[in-house]
Amino acid sequence: TGADTEAVVCAGTACYTAHWGKLSAAEAQNLCLQNGGNLATVKSEEEAQHVQQVLAQLLRREAALTARMGKFWIGLQREKGKCLDPSLPLKGFSWVGGGEDTPYSNWHKELRNSCISKRCVSLLLDLSQPLLPGRLPKWSEGPCGSPGSPGSNIEGFVCKFSFKGMCRPLALGGPGQVTYTTPFQTTSSSLEAVPFASAANVACGEGDKDDSQSHYFLCKEKAPDVFDWGSSGPLCVSPKYGCNFNNGGCHQDCFEGGDGSFLCGCRPGFRLLDDLVTCASRNPCSSSPCRGGATCIPGPHGKNYTCRCPQGYQLDSSQLDCVDVDECQDSPCAQECVNTPGSFRCECWVGYEPGGPGEGACQDVDECALGRSPCAQGCTNTEGSFHCSCEEGYVLAGEDGTQCQDVDECVGPGGPLCDSLCFNTQGSFRCGCLPGWVLAPNGVSCAMGPVSLGPPSGPPDEEYKGEREGSTVPPAATASPTRGPEGTPKSTPTTRRPLLSSDAPITSVPLEVLAPSGSPGLWREPSIHHTTAASGAQEPAGGDSSVATQNDDGTDGQK
């Protein structure tokens, strides 16, 4: 193909080519791929304009515009089995060359959901109208076509080729012709930017004369991010024209010598670069273009500048101002992250403290450690917390569940623990008998003994030492179901074990049960009380009969 027979637009770091061809999306993608590109992305309005420009070039080359709609494939596709996502700008579609989802979209109409087949996107053009800059082509979604059956109204496709940088077009200081050959095998004489690794053939002269010189240059990286041809001075200069032809090929000023020679120069504040044609600002930062704490960094050789932000800040969309980075978005902390201007800090949840491996790590606080336990009795550390427990005969109490309160086993929810009298003690209880009865060896039952009018008998102190079992009780429980009365030998089974589960019914015991039949009944009426299972609060039982209780101090009745 001759120069300018192909539609190509280069801008930024990419070139776009537009092609006629009734092909399926897969066939079009393969053609782009063969030259090192992909079907075009349209990730921003700016990119949409570049794509529109290249399509406009293509349409200008089509002699007869027909009154019909035409579609051109771009690189937006949705795989089979992937459903429409109306909440996203790309609706679940993605760019074939990869890359992130982008906020820009320009859908032609509301999409219908279909997950059963692959779907592809094309640009919808009215081929009878010239493309207007303000009206960017709409996106149309449909089947992707197959070889020989591209789909309705498919007329062509747009490719995109990305590059690390671009060279400026070569400046001619006299008559001549430049032909650029790009890495994607397109030739052109009119590129506004020429991609890295392109070749430029320069043929100087009027074309019909034999005195033509030719030059060959490559667009290459001369220094980091500096792309240039390596030519020095304007090309094809002629004394016949001096500065009159294309300003001598100079970027700014052209100065003629008396002998027909000329030199390029620059305006104040600019300097001439090594190519002896182009001017660059002496100090692009002199106008203080950066704001908000951003530092201006001049580019190499005085070309352009970049604003750089202090740590913890990033450039905003203008690329001139600094805004705080929300480091917490990257979840740098193990637990809580608090964003601060220019930084962030990690915090730990209650029950944790800073420490452990890694930045922002938290480790469990051992609330039960020596000297810091909040519990009155037993303390068990857990991940991020702790729980208190009580020894046998005590239950958890207090608003925060750290205190232990004695269980009055004599009013336990399971009914009487003793056959006759019950004496509550700190953390335990003892059984006793009415006058004339003695406590049996099991420590619970009463047996007929010598008649006595003294106080009710209990286990002799020297025989029964008040001991606890020593095991703790789970916080929910109030006592262990295997507990016997204080002083009961563990090997000796008690005749009656109390029901102590929290949901055990409270049963009233007839008064007769307290003493074996035939008991002389010579004793003072004890205060009768019982507890409710739910609250543990002691209430007068009115006339209800219950186990007679007596306190350890010898006083009878309620505590």
Partner: antibody, heavy 118, light 112 residues
């Protein structure tokens, strides 16, 4: 593998010229900058200049402007440095070095010793 | 031209211990693209120089990970964590940000 093979040592008289060579193998010769680095006896390294064999584009260290001409022959993958108007200051070892895509000088020739003496 | 300053000799080091070599530049080597164009080369006695570190902190192919480099835009340090006998030679820092490329004067690593 990448190799840069330089020509042998040279003993030349003051005022004369010398042309030393560097034959590259193991990579696309036309697509990488080829640098020349000078090292005087017991001294440090000085960048002399470079050539892009693809189109013959050259850059020189201003300090040595006019001292050398760099050329390259793509057909034989060989780069040349011609030194002119030699003085004792030009006595040194000259290394040819490939410049890679990270702007590092990653492969070095073994060096060519040039001695200028009457 | 960008000028760099290097001490001619390092403090003598014992084999197996760490060594540091520093280099200071007259201009920041941090490019607007975020890359720092600093390089380290080692020239062992009687040999051609070899690339150790490229773009400030990247280890060149075949270089042991005992070598590391860090720094700001103008001040840089090459660190060898466990010096071995084969590490002796002259260490050069260099910049490839702007033409002409320039090298530091070199620092000779000395073993006790």
């Amino acid at each position: 593998q990448v190799q840069l093979q330089q020509s042998g040592p040279e003993l030349v008289k003051p005022g004369a010229s010398v042309k030393i060579s560097c034959k590259a193998s193991g990579y696309a010769f036309s697509s990488y900058w080829l640098n020349w680095v000078k090292q005087r006896p017991g001294k440090g390294l000085e960048w002399f200049g470079r050539i892009y064999p693809g189109d013959g584009d050259t850059d020189y260290n201003g300090k040595f402007k006019g001292k050398a001409t760099l050329t390259a022959d793509k057909s034989s993958s060989t780069a040349y440095m011609q030194l002119r108007s030699l003085t004792s200051e030009d006595s040194a070892v000259y290394f040819c070095v490939r410049g890679d895509g990270y702007w590092a000088m990653d492969y070095w020739g073994q060096g060519t010793s040039v001695t200028v003496s009457s | 031209d960008i000028v760099m300053t290097q001490a001619a000799f390092s403090n003598p080091v014992t084999l197996g211990t760490s060594a540091s070599i520093s280099c200071r530049f007259s201009k920041s080597l941090l490019h607007s693209n975020g890359i720092t164009y600093l390089y380290w080369y080692l020239q062992k006695p009687g040999q051609s120089p070899q690339l150790l570190i490229y773009q400030m902190s990247n280890l060149a192919s075949g270089v042991p990970d005992r070598f590391s480099s860090s720094g700001s835009g103008t001040d840089f340090t090459l660190r060898i964590s466990r010096v071995e006998a084969e590490d002796v030679g002259v260490y050069y820092c260099a910049q490839n940000l702007e033409l002409p490329w320039t090298f530091g004067g070199g620092t000779k690593l000395e073993i006790k």
